[in-house]
């Protein structure tokens, strides 16, 4: 268990032409708040799919009123971190969605109005317990700068928050090979039984039965030194058998384009098509410097002393990508059948099967629902040999692939106003009512049970929505 923490540094116009209009005006002052949605893995999921790792909502920022004629500045931000607690192991790879919402504070009938200003998304690799990672994302003409980290909650420790701390058995020191559990100096790491034969000098484990190699070593038991002297070229993907680096066949081998850029060969070399927010020959320039710590998984950052010069991450064995964020992908052969999720554990590949399938490669069909995929968080319901999809709020149709208006069923009681939200819906309640769907009459203490708005309550206070 642990907590993912997100710190928003700034939200404002991005560089370049076409600066956005200020979202607030003298007639309609407004304030911002942010929502973060986390999902495990690196899958390209729809924004509407559940935030399986969790979600969090910020407080609202200070009220902002545009100065007439002035360009939109960085907008005032809410105080504090956004915290997303996770109960189980930290997955290491995750997808995020960060939304910037605007609350208009004019005299709307029925309370404040909200609108989505910007949504950014990305996929990252992150070890728990590491330093803050900084990031810049652009959405249209807006730019969002933020930092994030994952930390374990005691007694969990380790990069996945799976190792546990235990009280010391001896008062003076921990047992052989066991370290004190910082910051709980009076406790020791509980011993782990690694994979049988795993090199005690060059291997380690964070889960029982695992054998992960220190830099410079490879092989299932971390007993094979990585050698580059007999290799032909320092370019190309790592060979799992020899530990050598083998040459690639063309200029786009290994995709020289950083930050998700796509590579196309040209008569003389290659050309990168960069995603929004990145530029340069290899899409390597993003305004982030080595001082921001952009290299993951122990990667070494070189260059990039100022935002206009590129940084390069030199990755340790087993990782690749412009920020060393990608593990060398042995799952690309798609060994898992029936939509199973492939997990590269270092020493082995494992398939995590979808509901209704089993077996080492998810090859066994278990039940009626097995061949039936319900999209967008829908669940398959069996019954008498037949099956159907019970769709999540906001979706409909036979396989839950059709967008439905979650507000169409008028879920907000007592005149509450409904707003669609990417993970459900929110109700802004009429004065005198409360609850997720405005189903409760407000009862002031020491008064009758007639609905009444308590002093200072703004109906549908969006600071609460999570």
């Amino acid at each position: 268990a642990g907590v993912f923490e997100l710190q928003i540094h700034s939200f404002g116009p991005g560089p370049g032409p076409g600066a956005p209009r200020s979202p607030c005006s003298a007639r309609l002052p407004c304030r911002l708040f942010f929502r973060v949605c986390l999902k495990p893995g690196l899958s390209e999921e729809a924004a509407e799919s559940p935030c399986a790792l969790g979600a969090a909502l910020s407080a609202r920022g200070p009220v902002y009123t545009e100065q007439p004629g002035a360009p939109a500045p960085d907008l005032p931000l809410p105080d504090g971190l956004l915290q997303v607690p996770f109960r189980d192991a930290w997955p290491g790879t995750f997808s995020f969605i960060i939304e910037t919402w605007r609350e208009e504070l004019g005299d709307q009938i029925g309370g404040p109005a909200w609108s989505l200003l910007a949504r950014v998304a990305g996929r990252r690799r992150l070890a728990a317990g590491g330093p803050w990672a900084r990031d810049i994302q652009r959405a249209g003409a807006w730019e969002l700068r933020f930092s994030y980290r994952a930390r374990c909650e005691p007694p969990a420790v380790g990069t996945a928050c799976t190792r546990l701390c235990r009280p010391r058995s001896a008062p003076s020191r921990c047992g052989p090979g066991l370290r004190p559990c910082a910051p709980l100096e009076d406790e020791c790491e509980a011993p782990l039984v690694c994979r049988a034969g795993c090199s005690p000098e060059h291997g380690f484990c964070e889960q029982p039965g695992e054998c992960r190699c220190l830099e410079g070593w490879t092989g299932p038991l971390c007993t094979v030194p990585v050698s580059t002297s007999s290799c032909l070229s320092p370019r190309g993907p790592s060979s799992a058998t020899t530990g050598c680096l083998v040459p690639g066949p063309g200029p786009c081998d290994g995709n020289p384009c950083a930050n998700g850029g796509s590579c196309s060969e040209t008569p003389r070399s290659f050309e990168c098509t960069c995603p929004r927010g990145f530029y340069g020959l290899r899409c390597e320039v993003s305004g982030v410097t080595c001082a921001d710590g952009p290299c993951f998984n122990g990667g070494l950052c070189v260059g990039g002393a100022d935002p206009d010069s590129a940084y390069i991450c030199h990755c340790p064995p087993g990782f690749q990508g412009s920020n060393c964020e990608k593990r060398v992908d042995r799952c690309s052969l798609q060994p898992c059948r029936n939509g199973g999720l492939c997990l590269d554990l270092g020493h082995a590949l494992r398939c995590r099967c979808r509901a209704g399938f089993a077996g080492p490669r998810c090859e066994h069909d278990l039940d009626d629902c097995a061949g039936r995929a319900c999209a967008n968080g829908g669940t398959c319901v069996e019954g008498g040999g037949a099956h159907r999809c019970s769709c999540a709020l906001g979706f409909g149709g036979r396989d839950c692939r059709e967008r439905a208006d979650p507000c169409a069923a008028r879920p907000c009681a007592h005149g509450g106003r409904c707003y669609a939200h990417f993970s459900g819906l929110v109700c802004a309640c009429a004065p005198g009512y409360m609850g997720a769907r405005c189903e409760f009459p407000v009862h002031p203490d020491g008064a009758s049970a007639l609905p009444a708005a308590p002093p200072g309550l703004r109906p549908g206070d969006p600071q609460r929505y999570l």
Epitope: L57, P411, V426, A436, L466
Partner: antibody
Framework: QVQLVQSGAEVKKPGASVKVSCKAS????????IHWVRQAPGQGLEWMGI????????SYAQKFQGRVTMTRDTSTSTVYMELSSLRSEDTAVYYC????????????????WGQGTMVTVSS | EIVLTQSPGTLSLSPGERATLSCRAS??????LAWYQQKPGQAPRLLIY???SRATGIPDRFSGSGSGTDFTLTISRLEPEDFAVYYC?????????FGQGTKLEIK
């Protein structure tokens, strides 16, 4: 770790009042409603009321109106439930439980519960 | 208020068998129905919300179905740890109400 931690067991005399606390940690306190549910020995679950930690507004089950008061302290992320004019049939385990504010998600129902506080009313 | 009636009151089954628990509402609860599991001396634990969506960390042997007034909780293959009391709860309208519970015991 997301949790709700409740105060310890209480023994009260008929006619007295009891105040049970529920401290939230691991989530944004003002982003979830807190409900109170009680369970008499060997019986089922009975909903008592709801409080919104953000604005402090609350709503009570009709059965408890006039006897129950729910309050919150945002500085300590704690919600309180006070029940007055106690009688023997109020002997029960009192639970707090959280509910999210976006309809259609897990938090739509009571996804996290406190460990319960046993209140015994006896002369 | 919406009255929820669970049946049967007690269900005696063996591990490995399939369990089907019913919850009937006196008026429509739409799909705002949850199922909880409670073991002696413990707080209830959320299994199903929205009538058919599994809560985080709940094994896929648990499934819920129904809408309106008739709801079902199905446990496809009973494990020893599944023997407990199960409650349905409607959160469609105030006041929220619970069923009286179904005790699932080992045969």
């Amino acid at each position: 770790q997301v949790q709700l931690v409740q105060s310890g067991a209480e023994v009260k005399k008929p006619g007295a009042s009891v105040k049970v606390s529920c401290k939230a940690s691991g989530h944004i306190f003002i982003s979830y409603y807190i409900h109170w549910v009680r369970q008499a020995p060997g019986q089922g679950l009975e909903w008592m009321g709801i409080i919104d930690p953000s604005g402090g507004s609350k709503s009570y089950a009709q059965k408890f109106q006039g006897r129950v008061t729910m309050t919150r302290d945002t500085s300590t992320s704690t919600v309180y439930m006070e029940l007055s004019s106690l009688r023997s049939e109020d002997t029960a385990v009192y639970y707090c439980a959280r509910q999210g504010m976006i309809v259609g998600t897990t938090g739509d129902a009571f996804d996290i519960w406190g460990q319960g506080t046993m209140v015994t009313v006896s002369s | 208020e919406i009255v929820l009636t669970q049946s049967p009151g007690t269900l005696s089954l063996s591990p490995g068998e399939r369990a089907t628990l019913s919850c009937r509402a006196s008026q429509s609860a739409s799909s705002y129905l949850a199922w909880y599991q409670q073991k002696p001396g413990q707080a209830p634990r959320l299994l199903i919300y929205g009538a058919s969506s599994r809560a985080t960390g709940i094994p896929d042997r648990f499934s819920g179905s129904g809408s309106g007034t008739d709801f079902t909780l199905t446990i496809s293959r009973l494990e020893p740890e599944d023997f407990a009391v199960y409650y349905c709860q409607q959160y469609n309208s105030s006041p929220y109400t619970f069923g009286q519970g179904t005790k699932l015991e080992i045969k």
